[in-house]
């Protein structure tokens, strides 16, 4: 977890004199507890926005938007911490909106929003705009919670963003797989336009069952620069094993931005299909 | 312009089956994780379940886990909710939304964010 361009960070709006500052997640008001506290955020949304470094990358980021209720709290209300937990790892990160100048009321209702909170590819995030000052401990709560589920390098947006592309994304490698004669398996799949190795992941199932029957690894050597974009062709021999006839086929890249942590792509052949068979009728009648 | 066309309601007998269906136009489909969400007679709007752009993840309400189940047609631009073992109190319009942001908002944290586009379809359990 961080935040995108961190001095490019402000809260500041008409009538209102705010800063951003970096926050422990521990605000001052949980230890020392104040007598009058605002009220909860209202109509807290998190979208999924994508914003571009100074450096052209693109990166996914979390964009939070909240108003505040329309009561005199406001009176009492001295900024706003968000927090991004990140829900696999708890990691937490958190920032302070300090508001330098007193709230008043006006002819709309108030609206704040940040658009820092770089966000992960296929992670889930619980994002939490809680007002300071933070209640007392029996207080009603003032904070706003919600979950957010980022796509991952598949979904066409977060595709072209940079960890995403650093990951591989761009790459189809089309893969085909058929099966021949003699217990083997033909994969055909379209080079990258890089000169880097890859790998074949065989891994073959019973019918109706997930426990692998046979596994198989096939190294495929850096191609050449006329090589690229064209088509592999390997064929691979399985064990000769009844039933054991679903086969998924994987191919692990290793290209230079990603190593051995690149997206891989796979395919899967099924069994083939049983036909049924009737019981034959006989065509004579047994006496006995 | 969003457009969500819900289908498949009626009247059952409690313990009988339902499927529900939706279908959209007005907006890439199969970048968008979509929920179904409900209202009893009387009441507010309830979540029911969600589903994410892919089908890779999926959310239900706690009280209809294993009762209901979602899933979605992206070349066909449908989502569906199939509904068995129904109960009275499972009597509301249903609604399909799509989630307000190309991620997911998930655990139906984001019912108060939902909008609301089609006209529903009337789901009635009663004997």
């Known amino acids: 977890l961080r935040l995108l361009d961190h001095r490019a960070l402000v809260c500041s709006q008409p009538g209102l004199n705010c800063t951003v500052k970096n926050s422990t997640c521990l605000d001052d008001s949980w230890i020392h507890p104040r007598n009058l506290t605002p009220s909860s955020p209202k109509d807290l949304q998190i979208q999924l926005h994508f914003a571009h470094t100074q450096q052209g990358d693109l990166f996914p980021v979390a964009h939070i938007e909240w108003t505040l209720q329309t009561d005199a709290s406001i009176l009492y209300l001295e900024g706003a911490e968000l927090s991004v937990l990140q829900l696999n790892t708890n990691e937490r990160l958190c920032v302070r909106f300090e508001f330098l100048s007193k709230l008043r009321h006006h002819h709309r209702r108030w609206r704040f929003t940040f658009s820092h909170f770089v966000v992960d590819p296929d992670q889930e995030y619980e994002v939490t705009v809680h007002h300071l000052p933070k209640p007392i401990p029996d207080g009603d709560p003032n904070h706003q919670s919600k979950n957010f589920l980022v796509p991952d390098c598949e979904h066409a947006r977060m595709k072209v963003t940079t960890p995403c592309m650093s990951s591989g994304s761009l790459w189809d490698p089309n893969i085909t797989v058929e099966t021949l004669e003699a217990h083997q398996l033909r994969v055909s799949f379209t080079l990258w336009n890089e000169s880097t190795h890859y790998q074949i992941l065989l891994t073959s199932f019973p019918h109706m069952e997930n426990h692998s029957c046979f596994e198989h690894m096939h190294h495929i050597p850096a191609p050449r620069p006329e090589e690229f974009h064209q088509r592999s062709n390997v064929t691979l021999t399985l064990r000769n094993l009844k039933g054991c006839c679903r086969h998924q086929v994987q191919i692990q890249p290793f290209f230079s931005s990603c190593l051995n942590d690149c997206l891989r792509h796979s395919a899967t052949v099924s069994c083939p299909e049983m036909p049924d068979t009737p019981e034959p009728i006989p065509d004579y009648m047994p006496l006995w | 312009e969003v457009q969500l066309v819900e289908s498949g309601g009626g009247l059952v007998q409690p313990g009988r089956s339902l499927r529900l269906s939706c279908a959209a136009s007005?907006?890439?489909?199969?970048?968008?994780?979509m929920h179904w969400v409900r209202q009893p007679p009387g009441k507010g709007l309830e979540w029911v379940s969600g589903?994410?752009?892919?089908?890779?993840?999926?959310d239900y309400a706690d009280s209809l886990k294993g009762r209901f189940t979602i899933s979605r047609d992206n070349a066909n631009n449908s989502l569906y909710l199939q509904m068995n073992s129904l109960r009275a109190e499972d009597t509301a319009m249903y609604y399909c939304?799509?989630?307000?942001?190309?991620?997911?908002?998930?655990?139906?944290?984001?019912?108060?964010?939902?909008?609301?586009r089609g006209q529903g379809t009337m789901v009635t359990v009663s004997s």
């Open positions: 007005g907006f890439t489909f199969g970048d968008y994780a």
């Open positions: 939304v799509k989630d307000p942001s190309l991620g997911y908002c998930s655990g139906g944290t984001c019912s108060d964010s939902f909008d609301i």
């Open positions: 589903i994410s752009w892919n089908g890779g993840r999926i």
